[in-house]
Each structure stands twice: as C-alpha cells, then as structure tokens.
C-alpha cells in the first residue's frame, strides 16, 4: 500500500462522536527514538492555537500538551505506550464531551481533557519519524 | 453563534481597582479555556492573562500584570473574571476576552469594556 507524505494535513470538522483514525508504521528501530506527532490545529495554518498535541516516544513514553493564545501550557505524560517496533500500528482519537480519548492498537492509553471545543479544531496534522498509510475522520 | 460581552470598565485614579466580566455563550465555554487581552490605542492587541476550565490547571499571566492581576471564573455561569489591582497608566486600553483557538477572529469578540487609567 502505498504511504502518504509525512508531515501529512487533513482539513477536519470535529464534534462530539468523531474519531481521528491513523495507520502507520515507525520508519525506525526504537532504540534510535522515533516519534509520532498528531496536532490538532485550531485554523489551517501552523501557527494557530492547538487543541491538542499528541506526541509518542517511541517504546519510551508519550507527551501531551496545548498551545493556547500562542502559549504552551504544563505538559502531560504517560508512560503506557503500546507501539511495537517495525509494526503497523492503529492509532484512534476519540472526541468525548469531556476529552479526547486515545486508543492504541485498541488499548487507551489516556484521556485528554478539553481545553479548546472540538468545534473550533479545523486541521489534523500527523508528522514526525512514521511510514504513513492512513488518516481518516468517522464522524 | 459565538457572543461575547466584556464589562465593568471604568475610569480609575493609579493605584485603584476595577473587576472586568466575560459572558461567554454559544459554544462550550464551561469547558473552554478563556482570555483577556487588551488594545491601547495605535498598539498592538496583547495577551493579558487566561484560565482553563479546569481547576487543576494554573492560570497564566502576562509579565506586565503578575501580582496584580487576577483571573478566576464561574463555570456555572459562563463568566470569567480579571481582577485588577494597583492600576497604572500603561494599563489603559480596551480590554476584550476571548476562548482559545480564536484569538485571530476579531468579529467574535464583541465591544470590549474600556479602562483608562488617569489622574
């Protein structure tokens, strides 16, 4: 199957019920740290507010964070990362009432309050160290 | 539909207070972080000071207003307020609120309240 470009926008509408769902495939060994980063942006360019910023460690952690009124807030982690190295992982976002509920492989790994609507989110960009196969938005 | 109404400015002698109020409706503004910026005349907008909706996170203050300043809200009532103390000259201007993630669309944020600050 062939990949999309990295780093990768998707123009989005989200609401309470959607899911952000992303395939793909670290391009390299963990032991060198790769990374997946998943930003929702709040306008179709990058220096606009992020609603949430989502970015993996590859076999090491995760680390969650917003960017309000140009600032970046306190920064959230887990330690739970159930990406496996060179496997094809399924990355789903779920936009809750209250958070954005991630899921790995079909496992959550956290929930991330909201701080900004899902309303005013208008991009999904996926970039970082990922063979892309897929992103899609189930409303 | 977005709607905001900024109020409680006034004129105020250096050194006095005023409290400003932010209703906010038309989206989910309980669960929004919000802000209050404000615009001196000929100036550029800045950021003056926001708060989530959520407890456990710590409000943010511009340089210029730390330690005078305070944000709080009442998410029972889609108000948020900012306290302003020890008043200066330098803090005149218009004083707007506005969620995060549309602090570029200006037609949302309403009349703003005005604070002049004079002897």
């Known amino acids: 199957m062939s990949s999309l470009p990295v780093p990768y926008k998707l123009p989005v509408s989200l609401s309470v019920g959607s899911c952000v769902i992303i395939k793909g495939t670290p391009i390299h060994s963990f032991i060198n740290d790769p990374q997946l980063q998943v930003d929702f942006y709040t306008d179709m360019d990058e220096d606009s507010d992020i609603a949430f910023r989502f970015r993996v460690h590859f076999g090491n952690h995760v680390v969650m964070n917003r960017r309000e009124f140009g600032i970046w807030m306190l920064e959230e982690t887990t330690d739970y990362v159930p990406f496996e190295d060179g496997k094809q992982f399924e990355l789903c976002i779920y936009v809750h009432y209250n958070e954005y509920e991630i899921k790995v492989n079909g496992i959550r790994i956290y929930g991330f309050v909201h701080r900004i609507p899902p309303s005013f989110v208008k991009m999904v960009q996926v970039s970082r160290d990922i063979s892309l196969t897929s992103v899609c938005v189930c409303n | 539909e977005v709607q905001l109404q900024a109020s409680g400015g006034g004129f105020v002698q250096p050194g006095g207070s005023l409290r400003l109020s932010c209703a906010a409706s038309?989206?989910?503004?309980?669960?929004?972080?919000m802000g209050w910026f404000r615009q001196a005349p000929g100036k550029e907008r800045e950021f003056v000071s926001a708060i989530s909706s959520l407890s456990s996170d710590p409000p943010y203050y511009a340089d210029s207003v730390k330690g005078r300043f305070t944000i709080s809200r009442d998410n029972s009532k889609n108000t948020v307020y900012l306290q302003m103390n020890s008043l200066r000259a330098e803090d005149t201007a218009t004083y707007y609120c506005?969620?995060?993630?549309?602090?570029?669309?200006?037609?949302?944020w309403g009349q703003g309240t005005q604070v002049t600050v004079s002897s």
């Open positions: 038309g989206f989910g503004s309980n669960r929004s972080t």
């Open positions: 506005a969620p995060a993630g549309m602090r570029g669309v200006m037609e949302y």
